[in-house]
């Protein structure tokens, strides 16, 4: 509550997160023209990235374009991209939706469709839907440990969210254990009124708000965090504004002296830890 | 404007960025002793990195040191680094400018020059100038979509910069479309009074400031962002303080059972999105 | 000091860091069943990562699990993980401490011990102690250049911590050179009352606080940073809350057409640069 006689100071904060969990992924794998069911295990080194500070990312879905090489090829025949003659293809043109630079030639993509030839990483990425259900949908059961160190320099006061009395095998619960700082990802979504399974397909951004309302007067001292959760991306966003959360990254390698890459379009949840609050003292 | 009767609260913010664009890079490539012109295509997975939060990086230039191996070799003969006898080389010494640890021997670097031998990734990186013009100078035409979700927890008010009425094919313009959140990189520089082509050579840091001055009283409600741009690195910085913006990263691989790496010195623009402002309510 | 007649405004800040230094690492290397002493050099591309903004990470120690393949194998026999029969192993079970998914079979780990078989990256990571002393303990002598640009938008005032008069070969010292923004990592720890050699083993988080107390009135103008240092992780933390600072990342490669990875558990110091303060003007 507002104590008008107090000198208030905003919080200075540092956050450290640690994700735990393993996912088993089952997907169709094509090798030598034969498609079969492949099983693989993803651990933290596979689904998360070494990230600093107030954010962490958990990959929940992906689309791979394997064995890409820099060369010429027909671009992917997305809506409005087909051609019937070279006139439709403009040498040097880079369509923002395309993945390469046009050569000016209209060439066969397959039996029935022709598209503009591009200089690109080939074959160009197919614009296919993210797999549904999400490949790492079991990430719902992953947990994250959040360590938060705070400081009010003007009051020369420092504390943290994890106290020596806490139990390292706890799981946060709004009612039963509101001070535990180990969170099940699925619970975070439930608290925010969101469906993890649904969001995992396209990805999204989830806010974990840590609010410190600290009374630093010795006679009524109180300084503990309050956790709340809210979705930060717009689930009703128009296609043109890129709904969900994804990014592309590549693994480069050489094969028979040819530089190749595997392109991964990674969908997932970015968790932003938003720390705010004040410390007041007479 | 300052309404002194209002209770003001700082903004809590979350940012998500998405860069689009393709660059065609032409550079001299040496293979088997023969140098020829090589063309390559860079897409987002090649020139940007999966980054969290309030920053994104676009590589605009680079210098590669290919096929480095951990062994002994003469260090690069930069100014003041040449020697004429072993006396000038101190076993175990690490010159902060050097790339290795001296063995204590003075050895030939080429026909005319001798330098101290070092234990390092060899051959050591040549201290050559960044290519001019910048290899990815066409990044000027890339665009970035910025999504910003803000929250005033004390007023229990949330909004975002992208409204349902917005058009996903817009481009920000200070006068004609000041609420569009898709920015052409070249325009950002122009607005900040900077020359993209010039900065792209050595790299730099550009600030995109998003100012929310929100009046949350129902009778005069207003809460929209105002965008402004300013360069954050010091263009007049002394050499010793590392002007521009660059970092080194490595791609590791094995060849004939020997651990090798390609070292990339990446120059580019780091864009920092600085969100600030207040929400006031009676 | 508090000037009550002044209009105060919080600082908007952007940070850029540059680490310098080389480490020589000596460790036991096993090849073809023969163990010998291996020496290697680590430079910035090897021990740090391209990171944005207000954090940088310096790897000081590591544990490698080389040549892992996705297959079935016995899990590591950590405390409480051994079994004597299949009854102890639950098909499909993922123990949060384990690195895989149990198949339901109890199999020999070595001559004397049996553990539950798992589907995982095999052989699973051994839960061995971080090397002591730390492999990159010489990181104590690395230096970091910190560039900080600040802005008080309401007062339309911008400045930075590096002035044109500064000397690029300085090193920060609390008394002799408190405005130099090149810091020796070991000095940062000393200032914070911490032992670098000790923290380097398990890793930790170190705060570099930059405090700007700016009087922007022309008649008594003052706006320079004050640096202070404090450890942000809890050195007395219970095992269950993951003391120190580490993360795992992987290098993926193909060998004889088999997808493999080297898992690196990287321990190190994350430095958080915490910029705060106010600008006041009549």
């Amino acid at each position: 509550s507002d104590k008008l006689y107090q000198r208030k100071e905003p919080v200075i904060s540092s956050v450290h997160t640690k994700v735990k969990g393993i996912a088993e992924v089952t997907e169709n794998v094509t090798e030598g023209g034969v498609t079969k069911l492949g099983h693989s295990i993803f651990d933290t080194a596979d689904y998360t990235f070494p990230l600093q500070g107030n954010s962490f990312f958990v990959m929940t879905n992906y689309v791979k374009s394997e064995g890409q090489v820099q060369t010429l090829c027909p671009e992917y025949p997305r809506r409005g991209a087909q051609c019937s003659s070279d006139r439709r293809c403009k040498k040097g043109w880079m369509d923002p939706q395309s993945k390469g630079i046009q050569t000016g030639r209209c060439v066969p993509y397959d039996k029935t469709r022709k598209t503009c030839e591009v200089s690109a990483w080939c074959p160009t990425e197919e614009e296919k839907e993210a797999p549904r259900p999400a490949l790492l949908r079991s990430a719902e059961n992953f947990t994250v440990l959040i360590k938060n160190n705070i400081h009010f320099p003007g009051h020369n006061y420092t504390t943290r969210n994890i106290l020596p009395t806490m139990n390292g095998s706890c799981t946060f619960h709004k009612t039963w254990d509101p001070q535990c700082s180990i969170f099940r990802l699925g619970d975070i979504f439930q608290e925010a009124g969101e469906n993890f399974t649904e969001v995992a397909v396209q990805g999204g951004i989830m806010g974990i708000e840590i609010y410190w309302d600290c009374n630093l007067d010795s006679w009524s001292h109180h300084c503990r965090p309050r956790y709340s959760f809210r979705r930060l991306d717009d689930k009703n966003m128009d296609e043109s504004f890129v709904p969900g959360y994804n990014f592309r990254y590549a693994k480069y390698y050489k094969e028979n002296n040819v530089e190749k890459r595997t392109l991964i379009k990674a969908f997932g949840i970015r968790f932003d830890i938003l720390v705010f609050g004040t410390g007041g003292k007479f | 404007s300052d309404k002194l009767y209002q209770r003001k609260e700082p903004v809590i913010s979350s940012v998500h960025t998405k860069v689009k664009g393709i660059a065609e890079v032409t550079e001299n490539v040496t293979e088997g002793g023969v140098t020829k012109l090589g063309h390559s295509i860079f897409d987002t997975a090649d020139y940007t990195f999966p980054l969290q939060g309030n920053s994104f990086f676009v590589m605009t230039n680079y210098v590669k040191s290919e096929g480095q191996v951990q062994t002994l070799c003469p260090e690069y003969p930069r100014r003041g680094a040449q020697c004429s006898s072993d006396r000038r080389c101190k076993k175990g010494w690490m010159d902060p400018q050097s790339k290795g640890i001296q063995t204590g021997r003075c050895v030939p670097y080429d026909k005319t020059r001798k330098t101290c031998e070092v234990s390092a990734w060899c051959p050591t990186e040549e201290e050559k100038e960044a290519p001019r013009p910048a290899l990815l100078r066409s990044a000027e035409n890339f665009t970035v979509l910025i999504k910003n979700n803000i929250h005033f927890p004390g007023h229990n008010y949330t909004t975002r910069n992208i409204l349902p009425t917005m058009n996903g094919s817009c481009t920000f313009h200070k006068t004609w479309d000041p609420q569009c959140s898709i920015f052409r990189l070249g325009d950002i520089f122009q607005e900040a009074g900077e020359n993209f082509t010039e900065v792209a050579v050595q790299g730099g840091i550009m600030g995109i400031e998003i100012y929310w001055d929100c009046n949350l009283d129902s009778w005069s409600h207003h809460c929209r962002p105002r965008y402004s741009f300013r360069r954050l690195d010091d263009k007049n910085m002394d050499e010793s303080f590392v002007p521009g913006y660059n970092f080194r990263y490595a791609k590791y691989y094995k060849e004939n059972n020997v651990e090798k790496r390609t070292l990339i010195k990446a120059f580019g623009i780091r864009f920092d999105i600085l969100v600030f402002g207040t929400g006031g309510k009676f | 000091s508090d000037k009550l007649y002044q209009r105060k405004e919080p600082v908007i800040s952007s940070v850029h860091t540059k680490v310098k230094g080389i480490a020589e690492v000596t460790e036991n290397v096993t090849e073809g069943g023969v163990t010998k002493l291996g020496h290697s050099i680590f430079d910035t591309a090897d021990y740090t990562f391209p990171l944005q903004g207000n954090s940088f990470f310096v790897m000081t120690n590591y544990v490698k699990s080389e040549g892992q393949v996705q297959t079935l194998c016995p899990e590591y026999p950590r405390r409480g993980a051994q079994c004597s029969s299949d009854r102890r192993c639950k098909k499909g079970w993922m123990d949060p401490q384990s690195k895989g998914i149990q198949t339901g079979r109890c199999v020999p780990y070595d001559k004397t011990r049996k553990t539950c078989e798992v589907s995982a990256w095999c052989p699973t990571e051994e839960e061995k102690e971080a090397p002591r002393p730390a492999l990159l303990r010489s990181a104590e002598n690395f230096t970091v250049l910190i560039k900080n640009n600040i802005h008080f938008p309401g007062h339309n005032y911008t400045t930075r911590n590096i002035l044109p008069t500064m000397n690029g070969s300085c090193t920060f010292h609390k008394t002799w050179d408190p405005q130099c923004s090149i810091f020796r990592l070991g000095d940062i720890f000393q200032e914070a009352g911490e032992n670098f050699t000790e923290v380097a083993v398990q890793g930790g988080i170190m705060g570099i606080e930059i405090y700007w107390d700016c009087n922007l009135d022309s008649w008594s103008h003052h706006c320079r940073p004050r640096y202070s240092f404090r450890r942000l992780d809890d050195k007395n933390m219970d095992e269950s809350f993951v003391p120190g600072y580490n993360f795992r990342y992987a290098k993926y490669y193909k060998e004889n057409n088999v997808e493999k990875r080297t898992l690196i558990k990287a321990f190190g110091i994350r430095f958080d640069i915490l910029v705060f303060g106010t600008g006041g003007k009549f």
């Epitope: 064995g67 060369t71 010429l72 090829c73 060439v107 066969p108 397959d110 074959p123 040819v258 | - | -």
Partner: nanobody
């Protein structure tokens, strides 16, 4: 699925020439040739994009083999000269989406080079 039929294989003396041909059942962006010698892995020989742009050759055949295409007929030919015993293999025609990427291949035609 694309059907491919190769022809033109046979026995030839070292230093001699041979021309292989391949007809595809439908148009395709790239057409090329692979070969497999007994006990060895299948290897790429030559490839051609639409209208013969771009072309790509394995280092071992550069300057000796020439690939050519007829888009109208959906055919590709491989003119082989200066043949060596190590060129002995089954030669397969293939089609794909770039000169590096091939999805379909034919049954193959035997080429034997005697010394």
């Amino acid at each position: 699925e694309v059907q491919l039929v190769e022809s033109g294989g046979g026995l030839v003396q070292a230093g001699g020439s041979l021309r292989l041909s391949c007809a595809a059942s439908e148009r395709t962006y790239s057409m090329g040739w692979f070969r497999q010698a007994p006990g060895k892995e299948r290897e790429f020989v030559a490839g051609s994009g639409w209208d013969g742009i771009p072309t790509r050759y394995a280092d071992s055949v550069k300057g000796r083999f020439t690939i050519s295409r007829d888009n109208a007929k959906n055919t590709v030919s491989l003119q082989m000269s200066g043949l060596k015993p190590e060129d002995t293999a089954i030669y397969y025609c293939a089609t794909g989406t770039s000169v590096y990427h091939y999805q379909y291949r034919g049954q193959g035609t035997q080429v034997t080079v005697s010394s």
